[in-house]
């Protein structure tokens, strides 16, 4: 299809090579189709055009994007070419930073239903650069915490170095929704609830004597508890002997529950008692069996392949700790009678 | 309980403070608490709200920006300062506080009466 | 700001009837939504929050729904007590929870 007729909108993201970080496009269709097609509930019953431009439908996921190639081959669809850039309703996720990702993206509804519609693109201008040294050495994290129960702010990384005096206006989205009245370069959090947590981005206009551009960058928030002030406690084995059958194959499991944590480096191992000596047993991984807010239970068994007699004579023992210490738990083998 | 009191007669273009004193909690819990107005006859217009909590956050309402100010006196006492009034400003003023749990105003005060007039 | 339209402006209905009044937010606000009944010289009362929570000692009579940015409250086996008009809230302002704009009110007549 012609794309000479999209509207056209330039972006900037200037990525960090220190961190990890997302960057999205929105299919930003033109007012009023985009409020009918993207984000229809932002028209008010007033606001509704006289003839709507997309009557093709209202599914949030029905539009298509495609990448220009520079060397002006046909579009490519970016679902068959891009496996780091995924899209999601009408948004569009860029897994990994790079240069590579700079080009020109096009979205459309992908049902063309009015002769309105033909017409009815975006063009995206995306420049991606990293970092330089030069830039704010104290930025913002794209990834940001918020302590649930307690004050936050949630800060936008391109201008966290900027005095809220002189940052221009920006533009903040939650979860691909306009926060509408949020204009500033911080967003502060009376209290912290749950619902807090998202993908939260922010844009700010940058002009030079040519043409101006959007400058946008993502934040993932994410809602915390306060660190836990408790060792790792051990919830299985609870009895400190196990009766067993000798040459039959056993495992033993052991479960610990670990309170939150912002650093979390959790242990848990076997490791063997016998008289004097001590070592530390191969084991498969540990694995994650719940996870909450608040803490999570890790599990670790010790497989033996057939019980012998001098297990008998020997102690299991299950280590676990965290930052705050250390807990373990003991178990003697004792042979079934009977 | 809350209880508005400061209401009158005012002038046109005149000032006036209005105050919102709670019985029986204190702001210690960290409300939200607010102002909402409804002119004789009419509807019920949000006016502002402050966080009684550390951040202190305030918000009005569009046509309130510049004129009215909302603070926190004390832990008890919040205020509603109002400036270059005009007739389209009378109207009873509600003191409410949000509810933390059922979010909406599950506390109001019983009002009191604005008059702009000469 | 966002702007709630409240319709009808005006409802009658017969003892034991129902009626239905609707709510339209101009942008989303999710399940942000409160309900209240205000009756002469009184101040309003919290009946629906979250668009479909009955506050604590409200009838079950009243139920709240919604759909995207329209919300409905509906009050069924009317009683003369329901005569009152009837507020939509918006009750999240950016990221905060904080009770904001109005919709513009029903009067719920009981005949």
């Known amino acids: 299809f012609n794309i000479s007729g999209c509207s056209t909108k330039k972006l900037l993201w200037t990525y960090s090579t220190r961190s990890e970080e997302e960057f999205v496009l929105f299919c930003d269709l033109p007012e009023p189709q985009k409020s009918h097609f993207c984000h229809r509930n932002r028209l008010s019953p007033k606001q509704v055009p006289e003839h709507l431009p997309f009557m093709g439908s209202n599914d949030l996921s029905d539009v298509q994007w495609y990448q220009q190639p520079s060397n002006g081959d046909p579009l490519e669809d970016i679902r068959k070419s891009y496996p780091h850039i995924i899209q999601d309703k009408c948004t569009l996720h860029f897994l990994t930073p790079g240069v590579n990702n700079s080009g020109s993206y096009i979205c459309r509804p992908k049902m063309i239903k009015s002769p309105y519609d033909v017409a009815c693109c975006v063009k995206m201008i995306l420049e991606v650069k990293p970092q330089t040294n030069a830039s704010c050495e104290y930025s913002a994290s794209h990834k940001q915490d918020l302590l649930l129960g307690s004050t936050g702010s949630i800060s936008c990384p391109s201008l966290s170095c900027q005095s809220d005096a002189q940052s221009p206006a920006v533009t903040w989205y939650k979860n691909g929704k306009l926060l509408s009245v949020e204009r500033s370069n911080r967003i502060v959090v009376d209290e912290v609830y749950d619902y807090h947590q998202g993908t939260y981005v922010c844009d700010y206009t940058q002009s030079d004597t040519v043409s101006s551009w959007t400058v946008r960058a993502v934040v993932q928030v994410r809602t915390i508890v306060g660190d836990t002030k408790l060792k790792p406690d051990i919830l299985d084995p609870v009895e400190d002997t196990l009766e067993v059958e000798l040459g039959k194959p056993l495992t033993i499991s052991c479960k610990a529950r670990f309170g939150f944590e912002r650093v979390f480096n959790p242990v848990i191992k076997w490791y063997i008692k016998d008289s004097d000596l001590e070592w530390e047993v191969s084991v498969p991984e540990a694995k994650s069996i719940k996870s909450t807010l608040k803490d999570e239970i890790i599990e670790r068994n010790i497989i033996l392949e057939k019980v012998t007699q001098r297990d008998l004579r020997r102690k299991f023992v299950c280590f676990v700790q965290n930052s705050i210490g250390n807990t373990t738990q003991s178990v003697q083998l004792k042979e079934k009678r009977g | 309980s809350l209880e508005e009191s400061g209401g009158g007669l005012v002038q046109p273009e005149g000032s006036l403070t209005l105050a919102c004193t709670a019985s029986g909690f204190s702001f210690n819990n960290n409300y939200y608490m607010c102002w909402v107005r409804q002119a004789p006859g009419k509807g019920l217009e949000w006016v502002a709200c402050?966080?009684?909590?550390?951040?202190?956050?305030t918000y009005y309402a569009n046509w309130a920006k510049g004129r009215f100010t909302i603070s926190k006196l004390s832990s008890t006492t919040v205020t509603l300062q109002m400036t270059s009034l005009t007739a389209a400003d009378t109207a009873t003023y509600f003191c409410a506080r949000d509810d933390k749990v059922e979010h909406g105003y599950g506390l109001w005060g019983p009002g009191t009466l604005v008059t702009v007039s000469s | 700001d966002v702007v709630m339209t409240q319709t009808p402006a005006s409802v009658s209905a017969a003892v034991g009837g129902t009626v239905t009044i609707n709510c339209q937010a101009s942008e989303s606000i999710d399940n942000w939504l409160a309900w209240y009944q205000q009756k002469p010289g009184q101040p309003p009362k919290l009946l629906i929050y979250s668009a479909s929570n009955l506050a604590s000692g409200v009838s079950s009579r009243f139920e709240g729904s919604t759909s995207g940015t329209q919300f409905t409250l509906t009050i069924s086996d009317l009683e003369c007590a329901d005569a009152a008009t009837y507020y939509c809230?918006?009750?999240?302002?950016?990221?905060?929870?904080?009770?904001?704009?109005f919709g513009g009110g029903t009067e719920v007549v009981v005949k």
């Open positions: 402050i966080y009684t909590g550390s951040t202190g956050s």
């Open positions: 809230q918006s009750t999240f302002y950016g990221v905060n929870p904080v009770p904001n704009a």
